[in-house]
C-alpha cells in the first residue's frame, strides 16, 4: 500500500488556446485530470487501473502552482494504491478548459481539452522527488513525481506491513525495509523478549521486563547465581540448590554438628594441646605443671611425688626440693647409701644386692612401685582414658567414666547415634558418617521426629527429667530448657560427677 | 431512450431558404452543446455548425459562414438551423447530433433530413 | 485550414486484423474519436479520446493517438464491420472530420 504523488509546479499556455487552437474566450481557466495505471508500452486512454485525480481550477492560461501540501490542500495530488507497487507505471495529464463552475466532463465544451501528455516508464519507492517537463506546440508543464508507502507499509514495494508497537505484543519501531528494529531492552523476533539486567544468570535467572533479574527456585543474588543451601543448613555451603555441603570441621544433614570441636570453642587451657576425638569431642594434652579435662587446673610441682625413698617434697618459687630421709641423696633422693642389710624395701618389698653391695633394688608387690616400694600404684597416671572420659582407681584396678556418646574399658568407642533411639513418634533413625537423621511418620517432622505437624512441639512432652520445653514457633520445633545436672537436646544426659579419689 | 429527430429538409431553388428543426429528448437538452453535420451523397461528413449549450457560443464552418446560423430553444428542447442562400453543394443529408464535454466526440447522432437544392 | 488524411479503403480478411490510420499535424496532442457508418445509417460513435469505448461497443475495437498519427483497430474482423470509418478532431475553427476509409471485409 502506498501513494503516487504528482506535484504540478508550473503550466504555461502564453496564447491560451486549446488543444485545437481555439482560444479560450476570456482565457482557458486550467484544472488537471490525472490518470495513473499499469505500464503501457504505447499510453493510452482508458481505465486509470491504478488511480484517477482531478484539481479544482487552478489559474488561468500560465501560472506557477503552489505547493499545498502544508494547509492541507491538494498539491502534491495524491494517488493512492493498496497494492505491491510493481515498479513501472504508466500517467496522463489532461489539462482542461472550464469556462463555468462545473468541471463535469459532461459540462464542458466539446473541445476543452487544453494538452494532454502520456509518460511511462521505471520507478522506485523513495523520498526523492523526479522532476520533469513536458512541452507542445502550445503549453508547457512542469510537474515532479514520486512513490511513497503508506504508514506502515515498507520495503521496495510497500508490500511489508510493520505497525510500530510498545505492548505485550512486542516492542518494537520499524526500519525503512519493514524490519523491526527493537527498543533498548527488548531482543527477539518480535521483540517480546526483555534483556535481562546485565550478568543475570541464563539458566537461574529471568525477567518480564528489561534490566531485571528474577531468580528462579533454589536461587539468590542480584544475578541469580548464588544457590540457596537446604533450609536450616548452619556451617554448610551448596553448588545446587537446597544443597548443604559442610564447611571443614562440620558435619550432620544441617552441618550443625562440630567435628572440629578443638578449632571453634579452644577449649584446652593453658597452652594445652587439644586433639579432635570425634563428634564434639576432644582430648587435652597438658603442659608439665597442669591437670583437668581441660588442663585448667595448674599443678604444685610437688603434686607428681618426684621425691622418691621417702623424700618429702618442698615447693619452691623455681621448682621443688627433696628432702631426703637418711640413708639417701641426690636431686630425687634416688641415690641410697643403704644396703638390703638395712632392710630398705616396704609394703613387702624384695630386696636385692646390686654392684657387689653397693647398692640395692626393691622387688614391689602389686599395687606398690618406688625405689623403695613406698608408692602405691596410681593407674591413672598414664590418662588411659579416651575422649575426654575421667580415670577412677578402684583398689588394684581402674576404671574410665566416659562423657555421652562414648563407651568401652578406654572410652574408646562412639556410641551409635542410633543406639539410644533418638527419633520420636517411630521415626527410623539412619547411623551417618556425621551424625544420624531421622525419617518420619507422616504427621511428624523435625530432626527428631518431634514436632507434630500443625501441633504445640512440646505436646509429645519431648524434654526429660522435668526439663522445661518451649516451641520455636519459627521452626515449628521445641527448645528444652535443662535442669541443673543435665545436658542434651532432649536434657537426657547427667552431667559427669567429679572424680573421687580413695586417697 | 435518447433520441434525436430532424425535421425541415426538402427540395428548395438555389438561393432558396430552408429552417432544419432538430427534437432532442432521453437527455437534459440544456446541458449539452449541440452540432449539425452533413452528407453529400456519396460523400464524407462534413462539419456544418455547433452551439453551446446556453447558445452564447455558436461557431461554424468556413463553407456555410454568413449563410446558415444555427439556434437553438432550450425550453423546447430543439435545435434549429437557418439556411439561406442554398447553394447545389448545399445538397446533403443533414444530420443532428449531441456533442459529448470534454472530447468525447458526437455520442448522438439523429436519423437525418434531406436537402436538395436545384438550380 | 486543418485536415485529416485516411485512406479510401481497407480490405481484411474475417478474423483478421484491420487497421485504420488517421493523419494529421502534431494530431497525437489532441484526442480523437473514431466514427462507423453503414450505408443508409447515421454514423456511431465507436471510439473516443483515442481509445476510449463507449458502452455497447465490442471490445474488438480500440485505438491509439501518438505523433502525427491516429489508429483504429479492429481484431478478429467480422462481416458486420464493413463499413465506411471517419475519424474526428478539432481545430481553432471548430470540428475536422477525415475523408472517411471503407473497410471491405473479404
Known amino acids: 500500500s502506498g501513494v503516487f504523488q504528482l506535484q504540478l509546479q508550473e503550466f504555461i499556455n502564453e496564447r491560451g488556446v486549446l488543444a485545437s487552437g481555439r482560444p479560450c474566450e476570456p482565457g482557458c481557466r486550467t484544472f488537471f485530470r490525472v490518470c495513473l495505471k499499469h505500464f503501457q508500452a504505447v499510453v493510452s486512454p482508458g481505465p486509470c487501473t491504478f488511480g484517477t485525480v482531478s484539481t479544482p481550477v487552478l489559474g488561468t492560461n500560465s501560472f506557477a502552482v503552489r505547493d499545498d501540501s502544508s494547509g492541507g490542500g491538494r498539491n502534491p495530488l495524491q494517488l493512492p494504491f493498496n497494492f505491491t507497487w510493481p515498479g513501472t507505471f504508466s500517467l496522463i495529464i489532461e489539462a482542461w478548459h472550464a469556462p463555468g463552475d462545473d468541471l463535469r466532463p459532461e459540462a464542458l465544451p466539446p473541445d476543452a481539452l487544453i494538452s494532454k501528455i502520456a509518460i511511462q516508464g521505471s520507478l522506485a519507492v523513495g523520498q526523492n522527488w523526479l522532476l520533469d517537463e513536458q512541452t507542445s506546440t502550445l503549453t508547457r508543464l512542469r510537474y515532479s513525481y514520486r512513490v511513497i508507502c503508506s504508514d506502515n507499509y515498507y520495503g521496495d514495494n510497500c508490500s511489508r506491513l510493520c505497525k510500530k508497537r510498545n505492548d505485550h505484543f512486542g516492542h518494537y519501531v520499524c526500519q525503512p525495509d519493514g524490519n523491526l528494529s527493537c527498543l533498548p531492552g527488548w531482543t527477539g523476533e518480535y521483540c517480546q523478549q526483555p534483556i535481562c539486567l546485565s550478568g543475570c544468570h541464563e539458566q537461574n535467572g529471568y525477567c518480564s521486563k528489561p534490566a531485571e533479574c528474577l531468580c528462579r527456585p533454589g536461587w539468590q543474588g542480584r544475578l541469580c547465581n548464588e544457590c540457596i543451601p537446604h533450609n536450616g543448613c548452619r556451617h554448610g555451603t551448596c553448588s545446587t540448590p537446597w544443597q548443604c555441603t559442610c564447611d571443614e570441621g562440620w558435619g550432620g544433614l544441617f552441618c550443625d554438628q562440630d567435628l572440629n570441636y578443638c578449632t571453634h570453642h579452644s577449649p584446652c587451657k593453658n597452652g594445652a594441646t587439644c586433639s579432635n576425638s570425634g563428634q564434639r569431642s576432644y582430648t587435652c594434652t597438658c603442659r608439665p605443671g597442669y591437670t583437668g579435662v581441660d588442663c585448667e587446673l595448674e599443678l604444685s610441682e610437688c603434686d607428681s611425688n618426684p621425691c622418691r625413698n621417702g623424700g618429702s617434697c618442698k615447693d619452691q618459687e623455681d621448682g621443688y626440693h627433696c628432702l631426703c630421709p637418711p640413708g639417701y641423696y641426690g636431686l630425687h633422693c634416688e641415690h641410697s647409701t643403704l644396703s638390703c642389710a638395712d632392710s630398705p624395701c616396704f609394703n613387702g618389698g624384695s630386696c636385692r644386692e646390686r654392684n657387689q653391695g653397693a647398692n640395692y633394688a626393691c622387688e614391689c608387690p602389686p599395687n606398690f612401685t618406688g625405689s623403695n616400694c613406698e608408692k602405691k600404684v596410681d593407674r591413672c597416671t598414664s590418662n588411659p582414658c579416651a575422649n575426654g572420659g575421667q580415670c577412677l582407681n578402684r583398689g588394684p584396678s581402674r576404671m574410665c567414666r566416659c562423657r555421652p556418646g562414648f563407651t568401652g574399658t578406654y572410652c574408646e568407642l562412639h556410641v551409635s547415634d542410633c543406639a539410644r533411639n533418638p527419633c520420636a513418634h517411630g521415626g527410623t533413625c539412619h547411623d551417618l558418617e556425621n551424625g544420624l537423621m531421622c525419617t518420619c511418620p507422616a504427621g511428624f517432622s523435625g530432626r527428631r521426629c518431634e514436632v507434630r505437624t500443625s501441633i504445640d512441639a512440646c505436646a509429645s512432652s519431648p524434654c526429660f527429667n522435668r526439663a522445661t520445653c518451649y516451641t520455636d514457633l519459627s521452626t515449628d520445633t521445641f527448645v528444652c530448657n535443662c535442669p541443673y545436672g543435665f545436658v542434651g537436646s532432649r536434657c537426657e544426659f547427667p552431667v559427669g560427677l567429679p572424680p573421687s579419689f580413695p586417697w | 431512450e435518447v433520441q434525436l429527430v430532424e425535421s425541415g429538409g426538402g427540395l428548395v431553388k438555389s438561393g432558396g431558404s430552408l429552417r432544419l428543426s432538430c427534437a432532442a429528448s432521453g437527455f437534459t437538452f440544456r446541458s449539452h452543446w449541440m452540432s449539425w453535420v452533413r452528407q453529400a451523397p456519396g460523400k464524407g461528413l462534413e462539419w456544418v455548425a455547433i452551439?453551446?449549450?446556453?447558445?452564447?457560443?455558436?461557431y461554424s464552418a468556413d463553407s456555410v459562414k454568413g449563410r446558415f446560423t444555427i439556434s437553438r430553444d432550450n425550453s423546447k428542447n430543439t435545435l434549429y438551423l437557418q439556411l439561406n442562400s442554398l447553394r447545389a453543394e448545399d445538397t446533403a443529408v443533414y444530420y443532428c447530433?449531441?456533442?459529448?464535454?470534454?472530447?468525447?466526440?458526437?455520442?448522438?447522432w439523429g436519423q437525418g433530413t434531406m436537402v436538395t437544392v436545384s438550380s | 485550414s486543418y485536415e485529416l488524411t485516411q485512406p479510401p479503403s481497407v480490405s481484411v480478411s474475417p478474423g483478421q486484423t484491420a487497421s485504420i490510420t488517421c493523419s494529421g499535424d502534431?494530431?497525437?496532442?489532441?484526442?480523437v474519436s473514431w466514427y462507423q457508418q453503414k450505408p443508409g445509417q447515421s454514423p456511431v460513435l465507436v471510439i473516443y479520446?483515442?481509445?476510449q469505448r463507449p458502452s455497447g461497443i465490442p471490445e474488438r475495437f480500440s485505438g491509439s493517438n501518438s505523433g502525427n498519427t491516429a489508429t483504429l483497430t479492429i481484431s478478429g474482423t467480422q462481416a458486420m464491420d464493413e463499413a465506411d470509418y471517419y475519424c474526428?478532431?478539432?481545430?481553432?475553427?471548430?470540428?475536422?472530420f477525415g475523408g472517411g476509409t471503407k473497410l471491405t471485409v473479404l
Open positions: 474526428q478532431a478539432w481545430d481553432r475553427s471548430g470540428v475536422v
Open positions: 502534431n494530431l497525437g496532442s489532441q484526442y
Open positions: 479520446q483515442d481509445a
Open positions: 447530433a449531441k456533442a459529448g464535454g470534454g472530447n468525447v466526440g458526437f455520442d448522438i
Open positions: 452551439i453551446s449549450y446556453d447558445g452564447s457560443n455558436k
